[in-house]
Amino acid sequence: FRKAFSTLLGCYRLCPATNNAIETVSINNNGAAMFSSHHEPRGSISKECNLVYLIPHAVGSSEDLKKEEAAGIARPLEKLSPALSVILDYDTDVSLEKIQPITQNGQHPT
């Protein structure tokens, strides 16, 4: 469960095409995507542009998740990870494509 969260819910893009900003995608209790960025000193980002995963701070309590899961019995099974299904509202405008890392030349890694 935690692994699924850490893998899918808090991705850093370590290698923006033009600067050293780290962009963070987190998802709040209402399923809204929150994008933020801060600058890192040069040299602190690996050349390989590894994707770093963080468990987001804004994940709801287990009681909230239970409520959401039980109340949502009419919602269809998602194609996303089960861990995400409990958190994400269907109107969340976030796709895995949008939170994939971007390499120095601006391309998505394969």
């Epitope: 209402n30 009681e63 239970k66 409520k67 959401e68 899961e69 039980a70 109340a71 949502g72 019995i73 009419a74 919602r75 269809p76 099974l77 089960p82 861990a83 299904s85 409990v86 509202d89 269907y90 109107d91």
Partner: antibody, heavy 108, light 113 residues
Framework: QSVEESGGRLVKPGTPLTLTCTVS????????MGWFRQAPGKGLGWIGT?????TTYYARWAKGRFTISKTSTTVDLRISSPTTEDTATYFC?????WGPGTLVTVSS | AQVLTQTPASVSAAVGGTVTINCQAS????????LAWYQQKPGQRPKLLIY???KLASGVSSRFKGSGSGTQFTLTISDVQCDDAATYYC?????????????FGGGTEVVVK
Amino acid sequence: QSVEESGGRLVKPGTPLTLTCTVSGIDLSSYAMGWFRQAPGKGLGWIGTIISSGTTYYARWAKGRFTISKTSTTVDLRISSPTTEDTATYFCGRGDTWGPGTLVTVSS
Amino acid sequence: AQVLTQTPASVSAAVGGTVTINCQASQSVYKNNYLAWYQQKPGQRPKLLIYDASKLASGVSSRFKGSGSGTQFTLTISDVQCDDAATYYCLGGYDCSSADCSAFGGGTEVVVK
């Protein structure tokens, strides 16, 4: 994904009955499943839900009369002491994945 | 306990016409949008049409449209076809800590002429 109910039959009032919902392609450790019923010629009713953690929730009218439990591939509904009012088609499912239903007839 | 009141109980529509079904909840559904619409034909399992009040389920015709929020919801069927003859149910999801987790409306029978 697929869901199929079984165990429906003719029972006498007061005779406990367990219905089984067998799922395929649904990870019950990740998703909730519900039990519903429909009396002949009547509307749909929600009986209860079991969520991924195993926590169960019941309709107020169903508490004490029905018990939901699960294994990795099945979700059971136990009717502790059926009455004639429990005669209905019982469905198991969630969202867009429901079984075809199983008919329970309670009659002496 | 929550009550979902569907109106009308029965409606007749001509092929090509439009049908509107209302579902009024006695209390707000979870997150104001945990409301689904199901279609059921005699002897068949219910089929999900709409979830989260307005989202079309996979494989469902865009002639079906859901709208509403909180306690008032509507299912609209446009360009009605013979195959739309069925009973339609709304299903609300609620905060289980203060109410039943789910409740159905009483159903609306759609007859197509």
